[in-house]
Interface confidence: low
């Protein structure tokens, strides 16, 4: 039975040209995290593999930085970066946990961070 929950930064907003940290945290389980995938819609952004370390997809190398921790930093944001982002935790023996973050990239200088929320 999967007992864990993923806490994410939830709905967040940031300014065009700026940067933002996407963060997920898996709790309430003793399962071993073997890999975390970061995806935007159907595109793979990055992988953090417990054995092999970080890999950033070639098309995002200039604008994506690993960390902090298992999180991901997006840089030089554009309005096109607005959308859903997913952290996918591969664990043993539980299986896969997925967290969702919605990022809105704003033209103006008013960018507020949303509340944190949990996905069971």
């Amino acid at each position: 039975m999967m007992t864990g929950t993923i806490e994410t930064t939830g709905n967040i907003s940031a300014e065009k040209g700026g940067s933002i940290i996407l963060q997920c945290h898996l709790s309430s389980t003793t399962a071993q995290v073997t890999q975390v995938n970061w995806e935007q819609q159907d595109q793979l952004l990055a992988i953090c593999n417990a054995d092999l370390g970080w890999h950033i997809s070639p098309s995002f190398k200039d604008r994506v930085a690993p960390g902090p921790g298992l999180g991901l930093t997006l840089q030089s944001l554009t309005v096109n970066d607005t959308g859903e982002y997913f952290c996918i935790y591969h664990t043993y023996p539980d299986g896969t946990y997925t967290g969702r973050i919605f990022l809105e990239v704003l033209e103006s200088s008013v960018a507020e961070h949303g509340a944190r929320f949990q996905i069971p």
Epitope: Q35, N37, L44, I47, D51, L52, G53, H55, S57
Partner: antibody, heavy 122, light 106 residues
Framework: QMQLVQSGSELKKPGASVKVSCKAS????????MNWVRQAPGQGLEWMGW????????TYAQGFTGRFVFSLDTSVSTAYLQISSLKAEDTAVYYC???????????????WGQGTTVTVSS | DIQLTQSPSFLSASVGDRVTITCRAS??????LAWYQQKPGKAPKLLIY???TLQSGVPSRFSGSGSGTEFTLTISSLQPEDFATYYC????????FGGGTKVEIK
Amino acid sequence: QMQLVQSGSELKKPGASVKVSCKASGYTFTSYPMNWVRQAPGQGLEWMGWINTNTGNPTYAQGFTGRFVFSLDTSVSTAYLQISSLKAEDTAVYYCARTGGYSVDEYSFDIWGQGTTVTVSS
Amino acid sequence: DIQLTQSPSFLSASVGDRVTITCRASQGISSYLAWYQQKPGKAPKLLIYAASTLQSGVPSRFSGSGSGTEFTLTISSLQPEDFATYYCHQTIFRPTFGGGTKVEIK
């Protein structure tokens, strides 16, 4: 040229142990992870796990914990697979296979040993 | 673990035929897929990695394509030495192999 040479075939009784060796040559042994792959008679390929040849840290696939141990002797560029408490279902060809590097991009198996047949029979 | 499903399991073809083998992943694996050829009594041989990159020394009649969950290995003109079993292999996560496709002489 780069190659992996494995030890010869083994015939063992149930409950015994076996140690298969895989000697690398033609490249820097510690620069590439080593995998172990099992192929039961008439069956497909099954990844058993791998060992980081830099640190000696092993990673075991599901179903290959407990009786299976990966080890190294870097002084002779050799990886080892030891299987204890052998069962009839361990009868298979065991391959060592080099991974192309330590990043996910390179994680295909570019060099394989010739395979070692382990037969477990009473 | 990520499951790989190969189709067909068996394929009968003639020398000169164009042959296509499909590999489907249970979840998106980007382009982290390799293809191997195995002949009876021999070790597998790497043909394609990163879904479409030909391994050094492999004939150009072999090609790979696909991304995400669906991949194909194509042999443009089957040669006598190509009759063998072919396996796909995902390399994004803990490695898994497809069940294999045996290419036999018609």
